[in-house]
């Protein structure tokens, strides 16, 4: 069935939001820990799969919704269920920074998926 009617966030908008929430921040969401994920296995859904479990943190809600919109798109960049590193937990800010680094790389190489 059709995806939701929305101008899906662009990679550039996602990068801007990730920069916005990480700049000058030592921590996010009171240091909450999330499962580390393999961002190469469908980066939007993979990141969302980990971040979906974070609540009571307004700082990342916009990021969560952006990832959800991108993950919901069909054909999607990452409808594939990601493999979570169930033995590795990292801070939310670290995951967000990892995502930012990865997304910037994708953006630079023009592989918007």
């Amino acid at each position: 069935s059709p995806s939701p009617v929305t101008p899906s966030p662009t990679l550039k908008e996602l990068i801007e939001e990730l920069v916005n929430i990480t700049q000058n921040q030592a921590s996010l969401c009171n240091g909450s820990m999330v499962w580390s994920v393999n961002l190469t296995a469908g980066m939007y859904c993979a990141a969302l799969e980990s971040l979906i479990n974070v609540s009571d943190c307004s700082a990342i809600q916009r990021t969560q919704r952006m990832l959800k919109a991108l993950c919901s798109q069909k054909p999607a960049a990452g409808q594939i269920s990601s493999e979570r590193s169930r033995d590795t937990k990292i801070e939310v800010i670290q995951l967000v920074k990892n995502l930012l680094t990865y997304v910037r790389g994708v953006y630079r190489h023009g592989n918007f998926r």
């Epitope: 479990n53 609540s55 959800k68």
Partner: antibody
């Protein structure tokens, strides 16, 4: 305390439009989206879409394609839902809601606005 | 769209008993599942988010469980005030979708 107060009941003619307002208080309006959900008489809940007052970004349910417009007025902390080309199937209570604790889980709801379509 | 299949559609429970409501999704939701209750003439009320987390003020008689596609809401020691229609909500993907609802009434 988070509060959402909606405009009163509306009776509109088929083919016309309706605009429902949702005035918020008790939190920073631009921090969280406003979601809209409707409920036809005796039926379940149907998600219409949301607007992020921070940047005006919207996501709509495909079922309401081209007929719904969500807007937000930061100066009055009020969100609006306009539905056009109304038909009998649009008779419902329309709710606005916001999500603070868990993203996209509507936890604070307005009292609802009954929209009746009748000639 | 993700389809949420809620069962049963109605449930009659004696006070003090346990009520169980099931919600099955057409695809994995990870942990993006919430529960609401709606009383006649009222707006829906929040109960549980992220499968098993109770909102403040929700009695511990309400518990949520499950993962992936299968989820359950349990109401133990049912009281008169627990009557109403219960809905599940998936918030893993847009559009957000609700179950059809389960009407809980007292015997």
């Amino acid at each position: 305390e988070v509060q959402l107060v909606q405009s009163g009941a509306e009776v509109v003619k088929p083919g016309a439009s309706v605009k429902v307002s949702c005035k918020t208080s008790g939190y920073s309006f631009t921090d969280y989206p406003i979601y809209w959900v409707r409920q036809a008489p005796g039926a379940g809940l149907e998600w219409i879409g949301y607007i992020d007052p921070y940047n005006g970004g919207t996501t709509y349910n495909q079922n309401f394609k081209d007929r719904v417009t969500l807007t937000a007025d930061k100066s009055t902390s009020t969100a609006y839902m306009e539905l056009s080309s109304l038909r009998a199937g649009d008779i419902a209570v329309y709710y606005c809601a916001t999500a603070v604790v868990a993203t996209d889980v509507m936890e604070n709801w307005g009292q609802g606005t009954l929209v009746t379509v009748s000639s | 769209d993700i389809v949420m299949t809620q069962t049963p559609l109605s449930l009659s429970v004696s006070p003090g008993e346990t009520a169980s409501i099931s919600c099955k999704a057409s695809q994995s939701l990870r942990s993006a599942l919430a529960w609401f209750r709606q009383k006649p003439g009222q707006s829906p009320q929040r109960l549980i988010y992220l499968v098993s987390n109770r909102y403040p003020g929700v009695p511990d008689r309400f518990s949520g469980s499950g993962s992936g596609t299968d989820f359950t809401l349990r109401i133990s020691r049912v009281e008169a005030e627990d009557t109403g229609v219960y809905y599940c909500l998936q918030h893993w993907q847009f559009p957000l979708t609700f179950g059809a609802g389960t009407k809980v009434e007292l015997k």
